[in-house]
């Protein structure tokens, strides 16, 4: 039985040209995490694998940095970065846990971080 839960940064907003940290946390399970994927809609952004470390998709290499922890930092944000982001935890023996974050990139300078997490 899958007992784990994922807490995410939820719905967040950021300014165009700025950066944002996407974070997910898996808790309430003793299952072993073997890999964490970060995806934007159907595009793979990055992978953190237990044996291979981080892999950043070539098309995002200039704008994506791994961390902190298993999170992902998006830099030089554009309005086109607005949308859904998913963290996918691959675990054994539970299987897959998925968390969802919605990011809105704003043109104005009044963007506020509407999240439960404090974004440094």
């Amino acid at each position: 039985m899958m007992t784990g839960t994922i807490e995410t940064t939820g719905n967040i907003s950021a300014e165009k040209g700025g950066s944002i940290i996407l974070q997910c946390h898996l808790s309430s399970t003793t299952a072993q995490v073997t890999q964490v994927n970060w995806e934007q809609q159907d595009q793979l952004l990055a992978i953190c694998n237990a044996d291979l470390g981080w892999h950043i998709s070539p098309s995002f290499k200039d704008r994506v940095a791994p961390g902190p922890g298993l999170g992902l930092t998006l830099q030089s944000l554009t309005v086109n970065d607005t949308g859904e982001y998913f963290c996918i935890y691959h675990t054994y023996p539970d299987g897959t846990y998925t968390g969802r974050i919605f990011l809105e990139v704003l043109e104005s300078s009044v963007a506020e971080h509407g999240a439960r997490f404090q974004i440094p």
């Epitope: 940290i21 953190c48 470390g53 981080w54 940095a65 791994p66 922890g69």
Partner: antibody, heavy 117, light 107 residues
Framework: QVQLQQPGSELVRPGASVKLSCKAS????????MHWVKQRHGQGLEWIGN????????NYDEKFKSKVTLTVDTSSSTVYMHLSSLTSEDSAVYYC??????????WGQGTTLTVSS | DIVLTQSPATLSVTPGDSVSLSCRAS??????LHWFQQKSHESPRLLIS???QSISGIPSRFSGSGSGTDFTLSINSLETEDFGMYFC?????????FGGGTKLEIK
């Protein structure tokens, strides 16, 4: 197997600079963060900063920003930490440690830095 | 910066006892908390990652629990090799920080 090799010790004069090295082997060097940690006289551990060799991205604790510069040489799979304007307060053991999916999973043996005239 | 407070500073126990070490975070760090053991003149060794994830090669008598601000490292039936320093560390945000440590000594 994963190994992080550090020189055992360095002796430098006050006011001078030093470059500590950490040579990695046994894994894909550009796929993991490398961190540096300071420990004085067997006391607590202090996080100094980190570097991601795949992109040269760095982060520093504010306390060490004016003291430390982290660099990387991917051709030799080596991370360097440059410490400037050394004082006795910089005398400590400095560890490099790799961060993987399971946090700081491998550590170097540490370099004992002694600042003395 | 995130502050990690470990307690007690020193714990005197007998081999065979079971102990719980505490690490408190301020503010909330979800589950981004890791535990390390360090023996004299050795490098730290990872025991538990992300609050409760077991690490290959670490004896099963070590376990971790907690989330948010309160975390516990439990050691069942202490062996003589378990005595030393224990540190917690957070990776929720940069700068990463460590707790001040708990010294586990033989009574």
């Amino acid at each position: 197997q994963v190994q992080l090799q550090q020189p055992g010790s360095e002796l430098v004069r006050p006011g001078a600079s030093v470059k500590l090295s950490c040579k990695a082997s046994g894994y894909t060097f550009t796929s993991y963060w490398m961190h540096w940690v300071k420990q004085r006289h067997g006391q607590g551990l202090e996080w100094i900063g980190n570097i991601f060799p795949g992109s040269d991205t760095t982060n520093y604790d504010e306390k060490f920003k004016s003291k430390v510069t982290l660099t990387v040489d991917t051709s030799s799979s080596t991370v360097y930490m440059h410490l400037s304007s050394l004082t006795s307060e910089d005398s400590a053991v400095y560890y490099c440690t790799r961060e993987g999916l399971y946090a700081f999973d491998y550590w170097g043996q540490g370099t004992t830095l002694t600042v003395s005239s | 910066d995130i502050v990690l407070t470990q307690s007690p500073a020193t714990l005197s126990v007998t081999p065979g006892d079971s102990v719980s070490l505490s690490c408190r975070a301020s503010p909330n760090i979800r589950n981004s908390l890791h535990w390390f053991q360090q023996k004299s003149h050795e490098s730290p060794r990872l025991l538990i990652s992300y609050a409760s994830q077991s690490i290959s090669g670490i004896p099963s008598r070590f376990s971790g629990s907690g989330s948010g601000t309160d975390f516990t490292l439990s050691i069942n039936s202490l062996e003589t090799e378990d005595f030393g320093m224990y540190f917690c560390q957070q990776s929720n945000s940069w700068p990463y920080t460590f707790g001040g440590g708990t010294k586990l000594e033989i009574k």
